[in-house]
Interface confidence: low
C-alpha cells in the first residue's frame, strides 16, 4: 500500500477553494479502505470506502471529500478561511481483506487573507 | 462472548511436526470481520506473531517471515475451528502457543487480538 | 520491520502508586494500530488497551493509554494488587505483528 499526496504546498486566497489530493495504490484488490485525514496532527475526517463509496462526504469545517476510482481521493475545501492553514496529511488502511496502512507527505496549505493591507502585514511577519 | 478452545500434543519431536488446533465457540471461522490467528511465547523469543486465516469472501493467509516457510494455519468450517501446522521444529519451536481472534470494528481502523485461548505448551525434545 | 522496545524492564512500585510504562516503536506508526495488553503468571495477555488509547470492555479507568508517531504510554494511575503483571506493546497495522519485549510491573 502507498499513499502519494499533493501538492506539497499550496497557498490560496481566503473564500477561494483549495483541492488536495490523494492517490491511494494498492497492488491486490481490497474490499474496504479506510482513509483519513489530519490537520496539524487533529483528525478531520476518518470514513471509509466499500464498493467504490465514500461512508462520509463531509471533512472538517467546509471540508468535502470525494472519491474517484480507482485511486483518487480529494478533499475540496471551499470556501477558505484563514483557519485553514496547515499541514495536512493523508491516511489509508486496507481493512479487508488485509490490515496494512500507508500515510501520504504533508501538503503545507497557506491562507493569504482577502485584505491586501493584512497580506502585506504577514508576509513581513516571516522571519529571514 | 468468543471462547477458542485449544488442543494437541504437548511434546513433539524434532524434525517432525507440530499440530494444534483452535475451536471456536461465539463466533463462526467464517466470520467476514474476524481474523483467527496464533501466536507464541518463550523466554528467549517473548510473544511472537506466526499467521493469521481469514475470510472476505474467500479464504486468506498471512504468515509471520521467521517461520512463513514451515506453517501453514487451515480453516475447517465444518468444525468451526482452525489448525497450526509447523513442520521440521527444533527445540527453538519450544513455547506456550496461544490461538487469538482479532476483528476489524466498523466505528474505527482498529484491530486488535481481543480474544485469546488459554495457551498450550509445546515442548521439542527427544 | 517495525520494533517496539519497552521501558523499563522492571517497575518496582507499591499499591496506590502511580506507574507509566513506555513504549517505543524503531519507526513512526499510526496511533491506530497500538495496543497493551496485561499478562499473568499462567494465563494468556489481556487486551487493555487498542488504538492507542481506547479501553477495551471492562479494563476500569485507571488504566489509560497515549502517545503518537514513535512513543506510547501506558499508564495506571492508582496501582491497585491486581495490577503486578507484565505488560506488552503490540503494533497491528499489517504484518509482521510484532510486540515489546514487556514491563514488570513488580510490588516494592
Known amino acids: 500500500l502507498s499513499v502519494q499526496q499533493g501538492p506539497n504546498l499550496l497557498q490560496v486566497r481566503q473564500g477561494s477553494q483549495a483541492t488536495l489530493v490523494c492517490q491511494v495504490d494498492q497492488a491486490t484488490a481490497w474490499e474496504r479502505l479506510r482513509v483519513k485525514w489530519t490537520k496539524d496532527g487533529a483528525i478531520l475526517c476518518q470514513p471509509y470506502i466499500t464498493n467504490g463509496s465514500l461512508s462520509l462526504g463531509v471533512c472538517g469545517p467546509q471540508g468535502r471529500l470525494s472519491w474517484q476510482a480507482p485511486s483518487h481521493l480529494t478533499l475540496q475545501l471551499d470556501p477558505v478561511s484563514l483557519n485553514h492553514s496547515g499541514a495536512y496529511v493523508c491516511w489509508a488502511a486496507v481493512e479487508i481483506p488485509e490490515l496494512e496502512e500507508a500515510e501520504g507527505n504533508i501538503t503545507r496549505l497557506f491562507v493569504d487573507p482577502d485584505d491586501p493591507t493584512q497580506n502585506r502585514n504577514r508576509i513581513a511577519s516571516f522571519p529571514g | 462472548q468468543v471462547q477458542l478452545q485449544q488442543s494437541g500434543p504437548g511434546l513433539v519431536k524434532p524434525s517432525q511436526t507440530l499440530s494444534l488446533t483452535c475451536a471456536i465457540s461465539g463466533d463462526s471461522v467464517s466470520s467476514n470481520s474476524a481474523a483467527w490467528n496464533w501466536i507464541r511465547q518463550s523466554p528467549s523469543r517473548g510473544l511472537e506473531w506466526l499467521g493469521r486465516?481469514?475470510?472476505?469472501?474467500?479464504?486468506?493467509?498471512d504468515y509471520a517471515v521467521s517461520v512463513k516457510s514451515r506453517i501453514t494455519i487451515n480453516p475447517d468450517t465444518s468444525k468451526n475451528q482452525f489448525s497450526l501446522q509447523m513442520n521440521s521444529v527444533t527445540p527453538e519451536d519450544t513455547a506456550i502457543y496461544y490461538c487469538?481472534?482479532?476483528?476489524?470494528?466498523?466505528?474505527?481502523?482498529?484491530?486488535?487480538?481481543?480474544?485469546w485461548g488459554k495457551g498450550t505448551l509445546v515442548t521439542v525434545s527427544s | 520491520e517495525i520494533v517496539l522496545t519497552q521501558s523499563p524492564g522492571t517497575l518496582s512500585l507499591s499499591p496506590g502508586e502511580r506507574a507509566t510504562l513506555s513504549c517505543r516503536a524503531s519507526?513512526?506508526?499510526?496511533?491506530?494500530?497500538l495496543a497493551w495488553y496485561q499478562q499473568k503468571p499462567g494465563q494468556a495477555p489481556r487486551l487493555l488497551i487498542y488504538g492507542a488509547s481506547s479501553r477495551a470492555t471492562g479494563i476500569p479507568d485507571r488504566f489509560s493509554g497515549s502517545g503518537s508517531g514513535t512513543d506510547f504510554t501506558l499508564t495506571i494511575s492508582r496501582l491497585e494488587p491486581e495490577d503486578f503483571a507484565v505488560y506488552f506493546c503490540q503494533h497491528y497495522g499489517g504484518s509482521p505483528r510484532p510486540f515489546g519485549q514487556g514491563t514488570k510491573v513488580e510490588i516494592k
Open positions: 487469538a481472534s482479532d476483528v476489524v470494528l466498523e466505528s474505527s481502523s482498529s484491530r486488535h487480538f481481543d480474544y
Open positions: 486465516t481469514y475470510y472476505r469472501s474467500k479464504w486468506y493467509n
Open positions: 519507526q513512526s506508526v499510526s496511533s491506530s494500530y
